[in-house]
């Protein structure tokens, strides 16, 4: 009982004057509160309360459920308590089976006793299974058993409160512990595609996958630099305990150009936040953009190979591709493939493989591509470099020596005179006339050059060399002269290839 200090309000006194009282089931509970300023009795068990305004609390036939704390309070707010145990061999525990634990926190198994004189008040696993080795608990007969520092591994642990009564173990009803995990990492977020390209009116749909330990994770789709609420749909799954997955799908049923922008999937928990973005580009119509991977003017040596390569962006997907030369379509020698296997790829590569090109195969090679919205083309001008070929070398009636050579690039013709029998022709002779002739072949073909010198300048026997050359090579033709009296005679002309 409380001690009284004169002049100060004192707490009420309770009869019987003990802190704990044990009664048998069926017996009477009679508690008297003495205080001039009596206000109420309060009864509390399993954290539920009942009140009584009578100063004497009487329960004629006590039941196990009358076990609990009885508190008398006066008008000064001072109180005094007695704890009553109603001993019932058939009901040793009062229980509230709701049992939730937060990871790393303590949680109370609410199984207060109706008899404080039983022994070995503890927890036991269901069906004889042992409790986890690291599970620690503190029993309190008036409240229950406190599990210390709940672990994630205890989730859905089945247990009983247990006591020994007269040498026998008695178990309470089952409790199933539901553990709420602590967030110890940020959510994991991913998006179905990093970028989307659509035409106006098409549906935009993107899915964000959020993974975390529980469904308490928060997630939302946001449009960057906008407060507009976005319409989302959700699917979620628990892949076993503490492995939660949510799919948040954002849909714009008919996308417009001004819907273009960056969309962010944001998720957070008490540990932190994570986000991932996707970019939407909406175009009013499809497009094709072609990028040559080599110069569109191509020079290649006779007999060599060349690859004409383009990359192109096409949206929607390309439907027809072809390579054309001289109004003829190539059926083979070319390949077309996507630049990447990525689902959102819009970039493609096309390669035309030209092998052992002849001088006659120069010209315009055109790549054409189309999709459902547009057509596009690119042309390559291919020049085949050929060493000069001397087409004609003649002594004309007017006494001129004429040499006609063809090649690409345009050949240069030089003339040389070798007196007598000398093999080396070093003395150069200036031409009288040089002309570039129009080729009768296709454009991009060989260029024809005609050069003439006046043979009357030669007064001695010897050889005249016509030498045609360009970047690729050179070719010579020779005129042999012999004087018989006053007459100059052309002996058989011949050509000599000089590499």
């Amino acid at each position: 009982q409380p001690s009284v200090s004169p002049g100060e309000p004192s707490p009420p006194s309770i009869h019987p004057g003990k802190s704990d009282l044990i009664v048998r089931v069926g017996d009477e509970i009679r508690l008297l509160c003495t205080d001039p300023g009596f206000v109420k009795w309060t009864f509390e068990i399993l954290d539920e309360t009942n009140e009584n305004k009578q100063n004497e609390w009487i329960t004629e036939k006590a039941e196990a459920t009358n076990t609990g704390k009885y508190t008398c309070t006066n008008k000064h707010g001072l109180s005094n308590s007695i704890y009553v145990f109603v001993r019932d061999p058939a009901k040793l525990f009062l229980v509230d089976r709701s049992l939730y634990g937060k990871e790393d926190n303590d949680t109370l198994v609410r199984c207060p006793l109706t008899d404080p004189e039983v022994t070995n008040y503890s927890l036991k696993g269901c069906q004889g299974k042992p409790l986890p080795k690291d599970l620690r608990f503190i029993p309190d007969p008036k409240a229950g058993i406190m599990i210390k520092s709940v672990k994630r591994a205890y989730h859905r642990l089945c247990l009983h409160c247990s006591v020994d009564q007269e040498g026998k173990s008695v178990l309470s009803e089952k409790f199933i512990l539901k553990v709420r995990p602590a967030f110890k990492a940020v959510p994991v977020v991913s998006v179905s595609k990093a970028s989307y390209l659509l035409r106006e009116g098409e549906e935009f749909t993107v899915t964000c996958t959020i993974k975390d330990v529980s469904s308490s994770v928060y997630s939302t789709w946001k449009r960057e630099n906008s407060q507009t609420k976005l319409q989302e749909k959700y699917n979620s799954w628990h892949h076993g305990d503490f492995n939660y997955e949510r799919q948040a799908t954002l849909t714009i049923s008919s996308a417009r150009v001004n819907d273009s922008g960056v969309f962010m999937c944001y998720a957070n928990n008490t540990f932190g936040s994570a986000n991932v973005t996707t970019t939407l580009e909406v175009v009013d119509k499809g497009f094709i953009n072609i990028f040559p991977m080599i110069n569109t003017t191509v020079f290649v040596n006779d007999g060599e190979n060349v690859d004409l390569i383009v990359e192109y962006e096409a949206f929607p997907k390309p439907e027809h591709q072809q390579w054309i030369y001289m109004n003829r379509t190539f059926t083979d020698k070319w390949e077309d493939y996507p630049k990447s296997e990525n689902e959102s790829n819009i970039r493609y590569v096309s390669e035309l493989h030209l092998t052992r090109l002849k001088g006659t195969e120069g010209g315009t090679y055109t790549f054409l591509v189309s999709n459902s919205d547009v057509n596009a083309a690119i042309a390559f001008n291919v020049y085949v470099n050929t060493k000069p070929e001397i087409l004609t070398y003649d002594r004309l009636v007017n006494g001129m020596l004429q040499c006609v050579a063809a090649g690409f690039p345009e050949p240069t013709i030089d003339w040389y005179f070798c007196p007598g029998t000398e093999q080396r022709c070093s003395a150069s002779v200036l031409p009288v006339d040089v002309q570039t002739l129009n080729s009768s072949g296709p454009p991009f073909g060989k260029l024809v050059v005609q050069s003439s010198i006046d043979s009357s300048a030669f007064k001695h026997n010897g050889t005249v060399e016509c030498k045609a050359y360009n970047d690729v090579g050179k070719t010579s033709a020779y005129f042999n002269f012999a004087f018989k009296g006053n007459n100059k005679e052309q002996i058989h002309p011949h050509t000599l290839f000089t590499p």
């Epitope: 954290d47 539920e48 309360t49 089976r97 709701s98 926190n105 269901c126 859905r156 199933i176 469904s215």
Partner: antibody, heavy 117, light 111 residues
Framework: QVQLVQSGAEVKKPGASVKVSCKAS????????MHWVRQAPGQGLEWMGV????????SYNQKFKGRVTMTTDTSTSTAYMELRSLTSDDTAVYYC??????????WGQGTLVTVSA | EIVLTQSPSSLSASVGDRVTITCRAS??????????MHWYQQKPGKAPKLLIY???NLESGVPSRFSGSGSGTDFTLTISSLQPEDFATYYC?????????FGQGTKLEIK
């Protein structure tokens, strides 16, 4: 004698927020989980979420994600449920319910929230 | 989420009739022998009232004509002899897994 007494009816405009209160008595407020359930006119019951005893942790039905916040004021033994960005679909009676021994043993009388332009 | 499907959706019966309402869950709501399935009664303009908890336990103060049975995914609420005050809507509810869910309800009407 456990009692849950809820705040009165509310009329709100679309886009606004509402905060419903639930004052508890007859038990130790911090020892029991408080759930919120709503019922649209002529429709069934829909669980919105729970605020757990002690820690004040919450778990929400994902349908209401980002729009709902559940809180408590332990000094007055009152639970609150705030719902934001209201639309006409949120017109409903909102109930608080105390979880006891695995079930919803005690319910508030309900709060009608009408969302109308 | 666990989907609960009640049948029938509505039912006409007379005072004194025996009535059975079923609730089927899309997945089991059992754990360690407990079925986390409960039954509630709701009258117009009133809050739901708990009748049966953990599938078969009668809530204190509820008349004994109400009973519940079942486990796993199939559950039944039975009213052995209908009384006039029993005409109401009945809901099953699971709290084995979040989000907790309710059946769509069974409206019991006077024939």
């Amino acid at each position: 004698q456990v009692q849950l007494v809820q705040s009165g009816a509310e009329v709100k405009k679309p886009g606004a927020s509402v905060k419903v209160s639930c004052k508890a008595s007859g038990y130790t407020f911090t020892s029991y989980n408080m759930h919120w359930v709503r019922q649209a006119p002529g429709q069934g019951l829909e669980w919105m979420g729970v605020i757990y005893s002690g820690s004040g942790d919450t778990s929400y039905n994902q349908k209401f994600k980002g729009r709902v916040t559940m809180t408590t004021d332990t000094s007055t033994s009152t639970a609150y449920m705030e719902l934001r960005s209201l639309t006409s679909d949120d017109t409903a009676v909102y109930y608080c319910a105390r979880e006891r021994d695995t079930r919803f043993g005690n319910w508030g009388q309900g709060t009608l929230v009408t969302v109308s332009a | 989420e666990i989907v609960l499907t009640q049948s029938p959706s509505s039912l006409s019966a007379s005072v004194g009739d025996r009535v059975t309402i079923t609730c089927r869950a899309s997945e089991s709501v059992d754990i360690y022998g407990y079925s986390f399935m409960h039954w509630y009664q709701q009258k117009p303009g009133k809050a739901p009232k708990l009748l049966i908890y953990l599938a078969s336990n009668l809530e204190s103060g509820v008349p004994s004509r109400f009973s519940g049975s079942g486990s796993g995914t199939d559950f039944t609420l039975t009213i052995s002899s209908l009384q006039p005050e029993d005409f109401a809507t009945y809901y099953c509810q699971q709290n084995n897994e979040e989000p907790y869910t309710f059946g769509q309800g069974t409206k019991l009407e006077i024939k």
